[in-house]
Structure formats: structure tokens, C-alpha cells
Interface confidence: low
């Protein structure tokens, strides 16, 4: 399954929306910085598009879940959040269409299950951090910057897969 060209553009738009959501400078939040342990190797190890798509889907689904909470709605501009949801939703649709077309519908390899679990644990660490920091503006800014970084790394993987084919 070939992801449409619009999917790549949608990824760029998602990054740009995350950038627009910035409310305060990360420089003023240096004491709140945290290493969430993004499981980069889980993306780098998936050489088959069939293996990668479910992991990417999980990543985007978790971002959607994170930013669609009540606490998130209070933290960010409503209009930007709505645009952000729309972009994520479209990307989930693109990825789901690939799964329906037969990519990854065979038995799920254990390696892929492990990768999905690693992504879920990563987002659990982010959620726990936000709770511990009582959803402070700096905590949200640290998380916004982290999601930009991890989303960018995962979309770079998509691009490298596209160029390999």
C-alpha cells in the first residue's frame, strides 16, 4: 500500500500546528526538561512497511489521545487543537486504509507487538510526568516539544520507507 502524497503533507502540517501551539519559550522551562525515552529503535528496526504501519498508527493514536483530554483542552488554543485533531484523524484514516488493503492483516509478528507496547509505555511516561507536574504550562511546553521531536522522527521513517520503494 502506498500512503498518499497528502499523508506526507499532513505530517508537515501536524508539525507546523504543534509549533504554532507554543505559548511560552522552552528556554524558560529548562528546569522542567525530562527524558521520556522515546523508543526510537522500535521505528528504526521495522524494515517492512507492513511492520511499520501499525506502529505509526499507534504513535498517532496516542498523540490524539494525549491532546484530546480535558487538561489538554484547557492548556491549548481551541482553534489550533481542532485543526490538529483534523490532521491526526486524516493520518489515522490513511494508515487504516493501508491496513484494510492487506498490509499487516496477517498474524502480527511478536516484534511488532513489542514495538506497539513500547510506544504505549512511552506515552504512559508522558502522562505520568504531566500528572506529577500538575499539568503546569512548562510541563505542557516540555511535552509539546517532545511530541514534535518524536513525531518528526517517526515521520522521517515514513519518508525513508517511501524512498526505499
Amino acid at each position: 500500500c502506498d500512503l498518499p502524497q497528502t499523508h506526507s503533507l499532513g505530517s508537515r502540517r501536524t508539525l507546523m500546528l504543534l509549533a504554532q501551539m507554543r505559548k511560552i519559550s522552552l528556554f524558560s522551562c529548562l528546569k522542567d526538561r525530562h527524558d521520556f525515552g522515546f523508543p526510537q529503535e522500535e521505528f528504526g528496526n521495522q524494515f517492512q512497511k507492513a511492520e511499520t504501519i501499525p506502529v505509526l498508527h499507534e504513535m498517532i493514536q496516542q498523540i490524539f489521545n494525549l491532546f484530546s483530554t480535558k487538561d489538554s483542552s484547557a492548556a491549548w488554543d481551541e482553534t489550533l487543537l481542532d485543526k490538529f485533531y483534523t490532521e491526526l484523524y486524516q493520518q489515522l484514516n490513511d494508515l487504516e486504509a493501508c491496513v484494510i488493503q492487506g498490509v499487516g492483516v496477517t498474524e502480527t509478528p511478536l516484534m511488532k507487538e513489542d514495538s506497539i507496547l513500547a510506544v504505549r509505555k512511552y506515552f504512559q511516561r508522558i502522562t505520568l510526568y504531566l500528572k506529577e507536574k500538575k499539568y503546569s504550562p512548562c510541563a505542557w511546553e516540555v511535552v509539546r516539544a517532545e511530541i514534535m521531536r518524536s513525531f518528526s522522527l517517526s515521520t522521517n521513517l515514513q519518508e525513508s520507507l517511501r524512498s526505499k520503494e
Epitope: A19, L26, F27
Partner: antibody
Framework: MSQLVESGGGLVQPGGSLRLSCAAN???????MSWVRQAPGKGLEWVGS????????SIHRKFQGRFTISRDNSKNTLYLQMNSLRAEDTAVYYC?????????WGQGTLVTVSS | KTQMTQSPSSLSASVGDRVTITCDGT??????LAWYQQKPGKAPKLLIY???YHDFDVPSRFSGSGSGSDFTLTISSLQPEDFATYYC?????????FGQGTKVEIK
């Protein structure tokens, strides 16, 4: 994607005033906006910024008291009012969408201050 | 005020060359730095934001790196359309400031 078009530039005498406009082809209500200028053969210089609703304005220290920035979201237009103009204000003035970084720019309007 | 110092101020290179431009700030600015390309008579065009992210339609030969106060723009293989002036801009401290520019000329 928004497109920005500046207007209002031209030749003005030292001490004179000009009001520059920046019209957007779609909604800029949710974006901070900035003015950036560039003197002939020189680099880029930030002039000032305004928040989405216009409640917060920031002008570079060197222009305070002479330049004011405003916006009319109902007209999707940004303004730069320049008073007491000097020869060193001669430059191309750009408006831009400001996300911290500036991702959408107008084509610029030339302001020439000369007697 | 955060002063941004770009180097070199100009350079001559050939098509296919790898080109590196640096931007140093007087204060740390986390990753809040952008790179722009400007051609004569045209408005600047955003290339990279937040230190490393490409804007729409920016070729992958352009890459940004660095954080804190030292940043780099790299063009991996210079193309004829890349001859232009490049500016960095910090937005981590107020007021937002631009570097003085680096002119990339044909050797």
C-alpha cells in the same frame, strides 16, 4: 495557506508619516503578526509584533515612540503607522505571520525617506 | 538582547559542494532558531524552524542542527537554485533577532 500583501509604501520627506497595510487573503485572527524591514543591501531587522487579538503589542526599542502596530481582524489587515520618519528608515517593509519563526511573508513594500 | 552572529558572512562554492553556515547566540535559546533563504528582490523563505524541522517543500538537502547557543545550517549538495543569502533568527529571547546573513555565491 494565507497570502499577505503589503501596501502603503512610497516616497516621503524626513519628518513625515506613512501607514503601511498588510492584507491577508484568509483568516489571520488566530495568528500573531510581525513587521520586519530590510534596508537596501542590509540584513533583516524585526520591527514589531502584535498578538492575535491585538491585546499585546511589541515594538523594537529603537522604534518606540515613532512606530505603532495595530490590526483589524474584521478586515484581515495588519497596520504599521510610522511617524517622524528619518532617512535611515528607508527600507523594504515586510509583514509576516509570526509563530516565533515567520513562515508566511508578504512581498514587501518599499519606503523611501528623502527630501 | 540576544545577538546572533553568523559565519561566514559570505562564501564561494560550487554546485555539488557541501556547505555549512553557523549561527552563534550570546545567550542560550534552547532550540528556538529558524533559518531563512532570501534571493535578490524577494521576501525571505522559511527553511528550518525549531532548529531542525523543515518547512513545507524544503528539499531534504537542507538540514539544521544544534541547540543552546550554537546552530548549524547544512546544504549537503549545493544546487544552482541555492545561491542566495541565508539568515538565522532566534525566538527564544526577546526581542527576536536575526543574524547578519551569509551570502552563498558561485565559485
Amino acid at each position: 495557506m494565507s497570502q499577505l500583501v503589503e501596501s502603503g509604501g512610497g516616497l516621503v520627506q524626513p519628518g513625515g508619516s506613512l501607514r503601511l497595510s498588510c492584507a491577508a487573503n484568509n483568516d489571520i485572527e488566530f495568528n500573531a503578526m510581525s513587521w520586519v524591514r530590510q534596508a537596501p543591501g542590509k540584513g533583516l531587522e524585526w520591527v514589531g509584533s502584535i498578538s492575535p487579538k491585538g491585546g499585546s503589542k511589541s515594538i523594537h526599542r529603537k522604534f518606540q515612540g515613532r512606530f505603532t502596530i495595530s490590526r483589524d481582524n474584521s478586515k484581515n489587515t495588519l497596520y504599521l503607522q510610522m511617524n517622524s520618519l528619518r532617512a535611515e528608515d528607508t527600507a523594504v517593509y515586510y509583514c509576516a505571520r509570526d509563530l516565533g519563526f515567520m513562515d508566511i511573508w508578504g512581498q514587501g513594500t518599499l519606503v523611501t525617506v528623502s527630501s | 538582547k540576544t545577538q546572533m552572529t553568523q559565519s561566514p558572512s559570505s562564501l564561494s562554492a560550487s554546485v555539488g559542494d557541501r556547505v555549512t553556515i553557523t549561527c552563534d547566540g550570546t545567550y542560550g535559546i534552547s532550540n528556538e532558531l529558524a533559518w531563512y533563504q532570501q534571493k535578490p528582490g524577494k521576501a525571505p523563505k522559511l527553511l528550518i524552524y525549531d532548529g531542525e524541522y523543515h518547512d513545507f517543500d524544503v528539499p531534504s538537502r537542507f538540514s539544521g542542527s544544534g541547540s543552546g547557543s550554537d546552530f548549524t545550517l547544512t546544504i549537503s549538495s549545493l544546487q544552482p537554485e541555492d545561491f542566495a543569502t541565508y539568515y538565522c533568527q532566534q525566538y527564544g529571547n526577546w526581542p527576536h533577532t536575526f543574524g547578519q546573513g551569509t551570502k552563498v555565491e558561485i565559485k
